[in-house]
Interface confidence: medium
């Protein structure tokens, strides 16, 4: 028998009592549904509070721990330990002092290797008698290189003025040999320790043009925020060569990104940074030291468009008008201009310091360890957005002999572009990438 | 010269606190941490704290939170070092010590150390 | 933490030989790494730091050497005023130091 569809029995039921009629919609929506909402928004609103309390604590605070308390957030990276443990300063741009001398060196003669004597002081020529791989790597490690080396022999030239001595190795430092005789091979130790300073493409001499990554594969943009903020040159897998004052507005490193191998600023992925570090600021030269090593998270992987350029040679003395490259996504005009999409090029020359501090130009502010550049006429020149990108000289690879740094105005006739000298800063980077090999 | 002139002995009853004082001078008292580390008799030494002279910031090992205090006199470029609920084992020769910052800097100069000794 | 550790506890060593002291680091400390020279009664003496930098007025016959975890001083001619007791101590971005247990050198 099918049963009446409205009857109150249950379809299994005998003789049992018949069920309440159901409550109507509107009477289970007062007694249940209403309390829900209220619980629901109640927990919606404390969710909105919590997270908005925690937007604004850290927006405005930080949280030491042990004991638990909270700073400003303005005290993070002041260079002060407001948390007990420091963490207030653990991620932010570190200082290094200068250092001592690294024992060792390159010579822009052929990159040959010479080692220094501590109880003399004097500098003498690596004789490549008995020179081995292990020593090669011992001479790198000293520079704070941890890629493999490699050498050759060169001959030693008419007007070599150093001694030349042969080498050993104690306490993983080159010394000279004690019984060192006479230089047997007349070879001297030609040293390389990372390839470098190699495009794939050469550019071409004209005023400013659009660059192409492939002739500046070291070139990145280093961003803070995603906001382009400064250049920067790729040194070896882990380190980025840039300008100190790039991080005076921003010294906590977790928002700092860098973007390597395109010539395009937004079309590359961000590299996460592990370290910056800078030398301890100088107040009377305020604008020395303008130079920043960030080291890299993870290391990069070298390709057509990543690779590393050299560091200068010690002796890289450049003569006024020697040519010389700049590269950047700066300013194109100098007030109210943008900065460029592209990655544009342009060659300039060595302008003489003496000609550079007279009385119409710096009058005496650029330091020995700084560096001019531009045109004589003007016109050409890096702009606000280019600081911290290199300036390259080509022999027989790209070399990088200084960072952008300061001016005034861009591109005016007496005020060329000021950038900071790196052959006068080899020990203190040697000495930083040996610290954190 | 730099120079780092601590106070002398001290002897304490358990459960009493001791405070020893670091004079510096040869500097500038502010631009330098000062940091604390004890050796008990024919023991290695054992780093206690560090303060900032120039804001008066301060942090402690882990093993003395709650006991020791450190506080400076910018005047007198002195800086204090106070310990407290003193046990036997707190018998110990106490250092100052200066770092040129508290960042990547070891302690280039140490006071002549402190002898506190407790028992009752 | 990282915890440092010296080996040997003592070094017996003649005097005009070379002595060779170790010291390893629980995890990498890059060459934040200081040497300290203690002879009794006296305070502790800035030897090393930065691994292999000597600190002023430093003798050159105290050398120190290593990176990452492992780390050695080497005192090439020890001297009457060598023997002593030297501890290295892991310095870096964080305020919070460490010493290994220290190692005593003495006259054979």
């Known amino acids: 028998m099918l049963q009446d569809p409205d009857s109150d029995q249950p379809l299994n039921s005998l003789d049992v009592k018949p069920l309440r009629k159901p409550r109507i919609p509107m009477e289970t929506f007062r007694k249940v549904g209403i309390p829900i909402i209220i619980a629901l928004l109640s927990l919606a609103s404390i969710i909105i509070v919590v997270v908005l309390i925690k937007v604004i604590l850290d927006k405005y605070y930080f949280l030491c721990g042990q004991p638990l308390h909270f700073i400003p957030r303005k005290q993070l990276c002041d260079g002060e330990l407001d948390c007990p443990l420091g963490e207030d300063e653990e991620h932010c741009v570190k200082s290094f002092p200068e250092g001592p001398a690294v024992a060792v060196r390159l010579s822009k003669d052929r990159s040959t290797l010479q080692v220094l004597d501590s109880a003399t002081g004097n500098w003498f020529s690596a004789c490549f008698d008995n020179f081995t791989e292990a020593l090669a790597e011992t001479a790198c490690r000293q520079m704070g290189y941890s890629s493999k080396p490699t050498f050759r022999a060169v001959e030693i030239g008419p007007d070599q003025d150093l001694d030349v001595v042969e080498i050993t190795e104690n306490s993983q430092e080159l010394r000279m040999r004690n019984s060192s005789g006479p230089c047997l091979s007349g070879s001297l130790v030609s040293l390389h320790c990372l390839a470098c300073g190699k495009s794939l493409k050469t550019p071409r001499v004209v005023g400013v043009e659009e660059a192409s990554v492939d002739s500046w594969p070291w070139q990145v943009s280093i961003q803070y925020d995603k906001q382009h903020v400064c250049g920067g040159s790729i040194l070896d897998p882990h380190w980025v060569l840039t300008a100190a004052h790039c991080f005076r507005k921003h010294t906590d490193v977790f928002n700092w990104k860098v973007r390597a191998g395109s010539d395009k600023l937004g079309s590359f992925p961000s590299l996460a940074v592990a370290k910056i570090i800078i030398i301890e600021f100088n107040p009377m030269y305020p604008k020395d030291n303008d130079i920043a090593l960030m080291k890299l998270q993870f290391p990069l992987t070298f390709s057509g468009t990543v690779r590393p350029i050299c560091l200068p040679f010690f002796d890289e003395e450049l003569t006024p008008a020697t040519p010389l490259w700049i590269i950047g996504w700066g300013f194109t005009k100098q007030n109210g201009g943008k900065m460029s999409d592209i990655l544009l090029q342009a060659s300039v020359q060595v302008i003489d310091s003496t000609r550079c501090n007279a009385d119409d130009a710096y009058q005496g502010e650029v330091t020995e360890k700084m560096m001019c550049a531009g045109i004589p006429e003007g016109g050409v020149d890096t702009c606000q957005g280019d600081s911290g990108g290199p300036l390259m000289y080509q022999s027989d690879q790209w070399h990088v002999v200084g960072i952008v740094s300061w001016g005034y105005g861009c591109g005016g006739p007496s005020t060329p572009g000021v950038y900071t000298k790196v052959s006068a800063y080899l020990n203190w980077i040697y000495n930083v990438w040996k610290a954190e090999l | 010269q730099v120079q780092l002139v601590q106070s002398g002995a001290e002897v304490k009853k358990p459960g009493a606190s001791v405070k020893v004082s670091c004079k510096a001078s040869g500097y500038t008292f502010t631009t330098y941490y000062m940091h604390w580390v004890r050796q008990a008799p024919g023991q290695g030494l054992e780093w206690m704290g560090w303060m900032n002279p120039n804001s008066g910031n301060t942090g402690y090992a882990q093993k003395f939170q709650g006991r020791v205090t450190m506080t400076r006199d910018t005047s007198t470029s002195t800086v204090y070092m106070e310990l407290s609920s003193l046990r036997s084992e707190d018998t110990a020769v106490y250092y100052c010590?200066?770092?040129?910052?508290?960042?990547?800097?070891?302690?280039?100069?140490w006071g002549q150390g402190t002898l506190v000794t407790v028992s009752s | 933490e990282i915890v440092m550790t010296q080996s040997p506890a003592t070094l017996s060593v003649s005097p005009g030989e070379r002595a060779t002291l170790s010291c390893r680091a629980s995890q990498s400390v890059g060459r934040y790494l200081a040497w300290y020279q203690q002879k009794p009664g006296q305070a502790p003496r800035l030897l090393i730091y930065?691994?292999?930098t000597r600190a002023t007025g430093i003798p050159a016959r105290f050398s120190g050497s290593g990176s990452g975890t492992e780390f050695t001083l080497t005192i090439s001619s020890l001297q009457s005023e060598d023997f002593a007791v030297y501890y290295c101590q892991h310095y870096d971005s964080s305020p919070m130091y460490t010493f290994g247990q220290g190692t005593k050198l003495e006259i054979k």
């Open positions: 010590a200066r770092a040129r910052t508290w960042l990547l800097s070891p302690f280039d100069y």
């Open positions: 930065g691994a292999s």
